[in-house]
């Protein structure tokens, strides 16, 4: 598992999306076999 | 019904640690950030963190990476949250809650209310 | 990290009153701000979020507004059960901040 210290980053404000991370999914895990 | 229940009152002394628990019930575990949220006595709100219950990484505010350590165990869908070190000024009730990345923190626990005194 | 500062801290106001609650953040957080209600005994409930959008179950009675740095969550014509303390939180960047709440009593 990974640690990050939640700072604020310098995304444009052009972005209309929040800079939250979005919900976990299990695409991002990888699959065994 | 989603509901987040969360472990009873701690009377602990300075300098030692706590584990409050938080168990998941009513939607799927693995589907939302668990985060984590202190109410000091004067009812402020500080967010601790938040934890992947996939991956278990973490994203933490600063002011509590030396603090906090937040675990989940999927198998019983319950998220944990340990603090060390304690001293009078962690005093305060500790809320575990659901976010939602449209919603924000849609489901709050209970509360549990952590005492540190000698 | 996103200052939030809400006012009033304080607020006395009767049944059937429209009331305003104003939040500012210290720099552009689009339209991602939320409102909780804290209730003695209850747990925190989410009000809206993103601003303006109403959680499912709200009463529509509570309506939010704002984009950027200033946002209002307005309570028309207030109930028994809305008297409790209410509190804004940005949720546009890491780490989420809160306002310092308003409690909102009767008069």
């Known amino acids: 598992s990974e640690t990050t210290t939640g700072t604020s980053s310098n995304s444009s404000q052009s972005t209309s999306n929040s800079g939250l991370a979005p919900n976990p999914t299990n695409a991002t895990t990888k699959a065994a076999g | 019904e989603v509901q987040l229940q969360q472990s009873g009152p701690e009377l602990v002394k300075p300098g030692a640690s706590v584990r409050i628990s938080c168990k998941a019930s009513g939607y799927s575990f693995t589907g939302y950030y668990m985060n984590w949220v202190k109410q000091s006595p004067e009812k402020n709100l500080e967010w601790i963190g938040e934890?992947?219950?996939?991956?278990?990484?973490?994203t933490y505010n600063q002011k509590f990476v030396a603090k906090a350590t937040l675990t989940v165990d999927r198998s019983s869908s319950t998220a944990y949250m340990q603090l060390k070190s304690l001293t009078s000024e962690d005093s305060a009730v500790y809320y575990c809650?659901?976010?939602?990345?449209?919603?924000?923190?849609?489901?709050w626990g209970q509360g549990t209310t952590l005492t540190v005194s000698s | 990290d996103v200052q939030i500062t809400q006012s009033p801290s304080y607020l006395a106001a009767s049944p059937g009153e429209t009331i305003t609650i104003n939040c500012r953040a210290s720099?552009?957080?689009?339209?991602?701000l939320a409102w909780y209600q804290e209730k003695p005994g209850k747990t925190i409930k989410l009000l809206i979020y993103a601003g303006s959008t109403l959680q499912s179950g709200i009463p529509s009675r509570f309506s939010g507004s704002g984009y950027g740095t200033d946002f209002t969550l307005t309570i028309s014509s207030l109930e028994p059960e809305d008297f409790a303390m209410y509190y804004c939180?940005?949720?546009?960047?890491?780490?989420?901040?809160f306002g310092a709440g308003t409690k909102l009593e009767l008069k």
């Open positions: 809650t659901r976010r939602d990345y449209d919603t924000s923190l849609d489901y």
């Open positions: 939180q940005q949720h546009n960047e890491y780490p989420l901040t």
């Open positions: 720099k552009s957080i689009s339209k991602y």
């Open positions: 934890i992947n219950p996939i991956t278990g990484g973490s």
